[in-house]
C-alpha cells in the first residue's frame, strides 16, 4: 500500500521536472542550493539554477541524453562544486567536493549552519518593495525563497513554496491598495512569525531523524497522527506514518524534489481516502495543492470514536501481552502508542512517548520474570507521576504568566535559564528564553484539555533550537546531556536543572552596560531585547542575585532609558546617567 513505489525512471531529473513542473522545479532547486551554500550571492544561485533547469529540459526531451541517468545528488553536487569561491567562502566545506556520492552529500549536510553569519533582513519601505515587485516579480519572489532558505537551511521546502505563494498574494493585493502599508505590513509580520515557527518545527523533525533515528521520528508520527485521526485504523495510521517519514527523511536529507513530489502524492492519497482517515479533511481537500498540503498538516483533531474499550484489557490484563510483544515488539508498542494517543488528545506527544517508553521498559523487564503478569499488572500506575509532572508545571507557569504578562514572564525565564546554563551565549539565551516565554500567550489561553499538547510540544521545538545552536559551539556539558540523552525527556531534563554551582561568575565589564541614544529609535521588541540582554549579563555576573535584587536593577534600568529618551540631549544623558546606573547596580548586587 506504499504510495511512493514508482517504476524506475531512466532519468530521475526528467522524472521530477515532469512531476513538479518547471516553476516548482526551479524554486526547489534554488531552495536546495541556498540551503547548502548559504553565503553565495543570489545571482550566483540563480545562474546555477538556470543551468540545472536547462539541463533538465534536455533530459525531458531525451532521457537517454548524456548524464541524464545520473542521480540528483550527483548532478546537484557536481553543480555546487563548480562554484569558484568555494574554498575562500566556506573553508573546509570545499573538501566535500573531493568525496564521492553519497558521502559528498552527507558532507554538505553536515556543513549546514543553523546560525549563519548573515546580516539581519531589514524590511525596505513599502513603496520600494512594491516597485521591486512590479519591476520583476519573478526575481522578487526568487529572492524571498533565497533569503529564507539560506537563513533556515532546514526549512521544509514544499512548505516554503506555500509561504512564497502567500508572499506573492500579499504584494499582488496590497501594492494596489489605497494604504499599501496598512495592508501589507500586518501580512508580512504574520508570514515572518509563521515562517519562524514553521522553520523551528521542521528543525525538530530533522533533529529527530538525524540524531535519534527513524524509529524516534516514526514514534512521534504515530502519536501525533493517532491524536489527529482517532477514527482511523492502526493499519491506516501506520501507512501514513511510513509515507510521512519518507517525505521528511527526504527533505531533511536535502532531497527536496523527491520530498515535494512525495508530499503531493501523500496529500492526494489522504484526500482520496479521507473517509477512512478523518471527517475534518473535507475543506482541506478542496484546496489547490500547496494549500491542501499545508491545511492537512495543520488540520484539527477529529472527534474520538464513541465506546473506545479499556486499554488495560489488551495491554495489561491480557495473558498474551508478552507473546504479542515478543512476536513483533515495535508493532505491539506502535499499537499501544496508537491506542493511547487516540484516547488522549489532551496529552502532549512527548508525554505519550514517555508513557510508551515506560511501558516498553516494563515489558522488557517483566516478560523475562517468573510471573510476567504479576510483574506488569501495575504498569499503568507508573504513568500517573509522568502525567502529573507536565500538568503541574504548565499550571504553575500559566499562573506566573497571567500574573506577570509576556515580557516579565520572559524575564523570569531568562533568569531561570541563565542560572541553569550560564555558559551559553547571551544571544542564544535571550532568543531561546524569549521563545520559551511565548508559550504563555500561545497556550495559556487554551482550556485545560488543550494546554499540554500546545505547551509541551511547543517547548520541545524551542528547546531544540537551543540544542542545535549549542551543538555548533558546545560550551555546557549540562546542555549537551539534556540534548542528547533522550529526545522526549529534553524538557523534563532542562526543568530539573538547578543553579549551576560550578559556574565562575563573569568578570564585570562596564561596556556591556553602556547604552546610547540609538536605543530610543528602536522598536518596542528591539528595546526589550536590549534590556533582556542586559538582564542575562547581570545574572552571569551575579548568578546568586535574588529576584528582588534583579527586579530593582531592571526597574532602575527601564526608568533610566525612559528618562534619557525624553531628554533634550539624549547622548549626554545616557553617558552621565548610565555611569550612575552602573555604579548603583554594582552596589545593589554587591559586585
Amino acid at each position: 500500500r506504499g504510495v511512493f513505489r514508482r517504476d524506475a525512471h531512466k532519468s530521475e531529473v526528467a522524472h521530477r521536472f515532469k512531476d513538479l513542473g518547471e516553476e516548482n522545479f526551479k524554486a526547489l532547486v534554488l531552495i536546495a542550493f541556498a540551503q547548502y551554500l548559504q553565503q553565495c550571492p543570489f545571482e550566483d544561485h540563480v545562474k546555477l539554477v538556470n543551468e540545472v533547469t536547462e539541463f533538465a529540459k534536455t533530459c525531458v526531451a531525451d532521457e537517454s541524453a548524456e548524464n541524464c541517468d545520473k542521480s540528483l545528488h550527483t548532478l546537484f553536487g557536481d553543480k555546487l562544486c563548480t562554484v569558484a569561491t568555494l574554498r575562500e567562502t566556506y573553508g573546509e566545506m570545499a573538501d566535500c567536493c573531493a568525496k564521492q556520492e553519497p558521502e559528498r552529500n552527507e558532507c554538505f549536510l553536515q556543513h549546514k549552519d543553523d546560525n549563519p553569519n548573515l546580516p539581519r533582513l531589514v524590511r525596505p519601505e513599502v513603496d520600494v518593495m512594491c516597485t521591486a515587485f512590479h519591476d520583476n516579480e519573478e526575481t522578487f519572489l526568487k529572492k524571498y525563497l533565497y533569503e529564507i532558505a539560506r537563513r533556515h537551511p532546514y526549512f521544509y521546502a514544499p512548505e516554503l513554496l506555500f509561504f512564497a505563494k502567500r508572499y506573492k498574494a500579499a504584494f499582488t493585493e496590497c501594492c494596489q491598495a489605497a494604504d499599501k502599508a496598512a495592508c501589507l505590513l500586518p501580512k508580512l509580520d504574520e508570514l515572518r512569525d509563521e515562517g519562524k515557527a514553521s522553520s523551528a518545527k521542521q528543525r525538530l523533525k530533522c533533529a529527530s531523524l538525524q540524531k535519534f533515528g527513524e524509529r524516534a521520528f516514526k514514534a512521534w508520527a504515530v502519536a501525533r497522527l493517532s491524536q489527529r485521526f482517532p477514527k482511523a485504523e492502526f493499519a491506516e495510521v501506520s501507512k501514513l506514518v511510513t509515507d510521512l517519514t519518507k517525505v521528511h527523511t527526504e527533505c531533511c536529507h536535502g532531497d527536496l524534489l523527491e520530498c515535494a513530489d512525495d508530499r503531493a502524492d501523500l496529500a492526494k492519497y489522504i484526500c482520496e481516502n479521507q473517509d477512512s482517515i478523518s471527517s475534518k479533511l473535507k475543506e482541506c481537500c478542496e484546496k489547490p495543492l500547496l494549500e491542501k498540503s499545508h491545511c492537512i498538516a495543520e488540520v484539527e483533531n477529529d472527534e474520538m470514536p464513541a465506546d473506545l474499550p479499556s486499554l488495560a484489557a489488551d495491554f495489561v490484563e491480557s495473558k498474551d501481552v508478552c507473546k504479542n510483544y515478543a512476536e513483533a515488539k515495535d508493532v505491539f508498542l506502535g499499537m499501544f502508542l496508537y491506542e493511547y494517543a487516540r484516547r488522549h488528545p489532551d496529552y502532549s506527544v512527548v508525554l505519550l512517548l514517555r508513557l510508551a517508553k515506560t511501558y516498553e521498559t516494563t515489558l522488557e523487564k517483566c516478560c523475562a520474570a517468573a510471573d510476567p503478569h504479576e510483574c506488569y499488572a501495575k504498569v499503568f500506575d507508573e504513568f500517573k507521576p509522568l502525567v502529573e509532572e507536565p500538568q503541574n508545571l504548565i499550571k504553575q507557569n500559566c499562573e506566573l504568566f497571567e500574573q506577570l504578562g509576556e515580557y516579565k514572564f520572559q524575564n523570569a525565564l531568562l533568569v531561570r535559564y541563565t542560572k541553569k546554563v550560564p555558559q551559553v551565549s547571551t544571544p542564544t539565551l535571550v532568543e531561546v528564553s524569549r521563545n520559551l516565554g511565548k508559550v504563555g500567550s500561545k497556550c495559556c489561553k487554551h482550556p485545560e484539555a488543550k494546554r499540554m499538547p500546545c505547551a509541551e510540544d511547543y517547548l520541545s521545538v524551542v528547546l531544540n533550537q537551543l540544542c542545535v545552536l549549542h551543538e555548533k559551539t558546545p560550551v555546557s556539558d549540562r546542555v549537551t546531556k539534556c540534548c542528547t540523552e533522550s529526545l522526549v525527556n529534553r524538557r523534563p531534563c532542562f526543568s530539573a536543572l538547578e543553579v549551576d554551582e560550578t559556574y565562575v561568575p563573569k568578570e564585570f565589564n562596564a561596556e556591556t552596560f553602556t547604552f546610547h541614544a540609538d536605543i530610543c529609535t528602536l522598536s518596542e521588541k528591539e528595546r526589550q531585547i536590549k534590556k533582556q540582554t542586559a538582564l542575562v549579563e547581570l545574572v552571569k555576573h551575579k548568578p546568586k542575585a535574588t529576584k528582588e535584587q534583579l527586579k530593582a536593577v531592571m526597574d532602575d534600568f527601564a526608568a533610566f532609558v525612559e528618562k534619557c529618551c525624553k531628554a533634550d540631549d539624549k547622548e549626554t544623558c545616557f553617558a552621565e546617567e548610565g555611569k550612575k546606573l552602573v555604579a548603583a547596580s554594582q552596589a545593589a548586587l554587591g559586585l
Epitope: 465506546d307 474499550p309 479499556s310 488495560a312 484489557a313 489488551d314 495491554f315 491480557s318 495473558k319 498474551d320
Partner: antibody
Framework: EVQLVESGGGLVQPGGSLRLSCAAS????????MGWVRQAPGKGLEYIGI???????YYASWAKGRFTISRDNSKNTVYLQMNSLRAEDTATYFC???????????????WGQGTLVTVSS | IQMTQSPSSLSASVGDRVTITCQSS????????LSWYQQKPGQPPKLLIY???DLASGVPSRFSGSGSGTDFTLTISSLQPEDFATYYC???????????FGGGTKLTVL
C-alpha cells in the same frame, strides 16, 4: 434484550469462501473479547479463535491462515471470514462473548444461536 | 493441547450425585482458567462454571466445580430432570490461541 445473532451461513462449494456476521444488540461489543466456536453435526465444540477489544486476534493452530476474525465496533458486529473451505468445515458456527476483554479465558457467557455452514459440491 | 473428559457418556437418575472429570495435557492459565458448559440439542452451550469453581450468573447451586492445574471436576449434587444434556469443559492456556474444549460428556436418563 442482550443477544448475539449470527448470519451468513449456507451452502458453499469446496474451495469457496464465506463471511459470517455476528451482530450484537443490547450491549456494546467494544467491552469484551468475542470468539467463534463451531460444532460439526453430532460432534463436540471446537474453538476457532477470538478477537480482543483492541482488535488483537488469536486463532487455533488449525484455523490460522484460512480463517480471519474482524470487528466493526461502529456496527456492533464481529465477522468470521472463511477461505478455502473443505467438507470437514461443515458445522454450526457460533459467536460468543468472553468474560475477558483482552484475551480468551475459555469462559463464554453469551452465545448466539449459531448459523449452519454446509461445504459440499 | 488436549482436554480429556471422562466419562464420554453417563446414565443417571433424578436425585443422583454426578461427577464429570476433565484433564488437560498441560496446566491451564493461572492454574484455574477452566470453564464448564451445558448444551441441550438444538441450543447453544450455556456457561455453568468459570475459573474452575465460580458459578456463572443464574446457575443453580447444585452445580459446583473444583480442581487446579490439570485436573478438574464438575459435580451435580442432585440431578434434576432439566440437567440431562451434554457437558463440556474448556481450558484457557498461556496463549489465547490454545483455548480448547473437551470432547464432551453426554448425560442421559438411566
Amino acid at each position: 434484550e442482550v443477544q448475539l445473532v449470527e448470519s451468513g451461513g449456507g451452502l458453499v462449494q469446496p474451495g469457496g469462501s464465506l463471511r459470517l456476521s455476528c451482530a450484537a444488540s443490547g450491549f456494546s461489543l467494544s467491552s469484551n473479547a468475542m470468539g467463534w466456536v463451531r460444532q460439526a453435526p453430532g460432534k463436540g465444540l471446537e474453538y476457532i479463535g477470538i478477537i480482543s477489544v483492541g482488535g488483537f486476534t488469536y486463532y487455533a493452530s488449525w484455523a490460522k491462515g484460512r480463517f480471519t476474525i474482524s470487528r466493526d465496533n461502529s456496527k456492533n458486529t464481529v465477522y468470521l471470514q472463511m477461505n478455502s473451505l473443505r467438507a470437514e468445515d461443515t458445522a454450526t458456527y457460533f459467536c460468543a462473548r468472553d468474560r475477558h476483554g483482552g484475551d480468551s479465558s475459555g469462559a463464554f457467557y453469551l452465545w448466539g444461536q449459531g448459523t449452519l455452514v454446509t461445504v459440499s459440491s | 493441547i488436549q482436554m480429556t473428559q471422562s466419562p464420554s457418556s453417563l446414565s443417571a437418575s433424578v436425585g443422583d450425585r454426578v461427577t464429570i472429570t476433565c484433564q488437560s495435557s498441560e496446566s491451564v492459565y493461572s492454574n484455574n482458567q477452566l470453564s464448564w458448559y451445558q448444551q441441550k440439542p438444538g441450543q447453544p452451550p450455556k456457561l455453568l462454571i468459570y475459573d474452575a469453581s465460580d458459578l456463572a450468573s443464574g446457575v443453580p447451586s447444585r452445580f459446583s466445580g473444583s480442581g487446579s492445574g490439570t485436573d478438574f471436576t464438575l459435580t451435580i449434587s442432585s440431578l434434576q430432570p432439566e440437567d440431562f444434556a451434554t457437558y463440556y469443559c474448556a481450558g484457557g492456556f498461556s496463549s489465547s490461541s490454545d483455548t480448547a474444549f473437551g470432547g464432551g460428556t453426554k448425560l442421559t436418563v438411566l
